[in-house]
Interface confidence: low
């Protein structure tokens, strides 16, 4: 069974940093592209970033480009999101999601999410 | 970025009735050489992560009941629930994965008409 478990969320001040992790199990991690999607309280879904199965290609939403870095460690089956220069508008539940193949496509499996709160 | 516009924002349908949600993309998401539309639909219930319902515009996700169907091509797409059940109450989002950044519609809330 596919399992995705996010961690690393919490309360941080504007300008601060956080590193989210997503531990994956139940599938061959390196064979799938992975994405981060966020959802602000009471709002819709926003795609944040994606990474190909090998880690060779990374993609970002304009709103996080230059501040967030997606990466993966295929030997540990773990996905990461390094978030720097955090802003109040980054407050959201961050979901880690597995796509249907090794390039960026639809996401068929999602974690339960980890809450990031940016506030002074 | 490709802009996704869903309609309506919410709809109330009686149990057993048909529910139809529309999604319009600001540019075509049909990749002609593959004859595939790079569009997916997700269902999200309160307090839960989204669940993939439809991908490639018309392919049902794993374990999705056959009362759910997707149709459309190019820029106009529809998600249909042929006979609404109580467990279908949720917010539904369309998403394009034709180009990065991937983008979602604003969501359509489906409720039961009392």
């Amino acid at each position: 069974e596919v399992q995705l478990l996010e961690s690393g969320g919490g309360l941080v001040q504007p300008g601060g940093s956080l590193r989210l992790s997503c531990a994956a199990s139940g599938f061959t991690f390196s064979g799938y592209a992975m994405t981060w999607v966020r959802q602000a309280p009471g709002k819709g879904l926003k795609w944040v970033s994606g990474i190909s199965g090998s880690g060779g290609s990374t993609y970002y939403a304009a709103s996080v480009k230059g501040r967030f870095t997606i990466s993966r460690d295929n030997s540990k089956s773990t996905l990461y999101l390094q978030m720097n220069s955090l802003r109040a508008e980054d407050t959201a539940v961050y979901y880690c999601a597995k796509t249907i193949n090794d390039i960026l496509t639809a996401t068929e499996d999602w974690g339960q999410g980890t809450l990031v709160t940016v506030s002074s | 970025d490709i802009v996704m516009t869903q309609s309506p924002d919410s709809l109330a349908v009686s149990l057993g009735e048909r529910a139809t949600i529309n999604c319009k993309t600001s540019q075509s998401v049909l990749y002609s050489s593959k004859k595939k539309n790079y569009l997916a639909w997700y269902q999200q219930k309160p307090g839960q992560p989204p669940k993939l319902v439809i991908y490639w515009a018309s392919t049902r996700g794993s374990g999705v009941p056959d009362r759910f169907s997707g149709s459309g091509s190019g820029t106009d797409f529809t998600l249909t629930i042929s006979s609404l059940q109580a467990e279908d109450v949720a917010v539904y989002y369309c998403q394009q994965y034709y180009s990065t950044p991937q983008t979602f519609g604003q969501g359509t809330k489906v409720e039961i008409k009392r």
């Epitope: 190909s52 199965g53 060779g56 993609y59 480009k65 390039i103 | -």
Partner: antibody, heavy 115, light 106 residues
Framework: EVQLVESGGGLVKPGGSLKLSCTAS????????MSWVRQSPEKRLEWVAE?????????YSDTVTGRFSISRDNAKNSTLYLEMNSLRSEDTAIYYC???????WGQGTLVTVSA | QIVLTQSPAIMSASPGEKVTMTCSVS?????MHWFRQKPGTSPKLWIY???NLASGVPARFSGSGSGTSYSLTISRMEAEDAATYYC?????????FGSGTKLEIK
Amino acid sequence: EVQLVESGGGLVKPGGSLKLSCTASGFTFSSYAMSWVRQSPEKRLEWVAEISSGGIHTYYSDTVTGRFSISRDNAKNSTLYLEMNSLRSEDTAIYYCARETTGTWGQGTLVTVSA
Amino acid sequence: QIVLTQSPAIMSASPGEKVTMTCSVSSSITYMHWFRQKPGTSPKLWIYTTSNLASGVPARFSGSGSGTSYSLTISRMEAEDAATYYCQQRSRYPFTFGSGTKLEIK
């Protein structure tokens, strides 16, 4: 050291066929999407096709769709292929094999389509 | 498909001079790649995801831009920089290249 070596190019008549190969070494071939890119005699670059790391998903330029087929052999010999049918004079080019993100290219193989 | 228009097609610069070439995009994309090609050799990735220098690329090179407008800049031209530079988008299939900017030394 990452290496990509193309072969299989040559002179072929319009309507003919060729199969290009690209042998990869120095990296885990099965972990990377791979592409074919060509460069015309006028030096114009054109992305031709891409295949996902597992070989399941393929993508083509509209100019070659239905005529060219990209494939790969991850199991035996870490080789990328491009099967080219119904060749036209405008397919004349140097064909390069490239690794995902096109950071690594081979030296290319020349395909000439002429009567 | 997305059309990339590079300008100028050909340019020349003196050693030490600042050089800027542009790549205009027919519809907004997320990032741009740049390649350098010298005669008789295959193209080489030079700048990736708009502003990141590929391995071994001198710091006098920089890339910038967003949406529909991207550029490659050389802060001080050197003889070895003479080459043809191509932009490429990988945001949307089919991936496309610009027609190239040929940079010559004065």
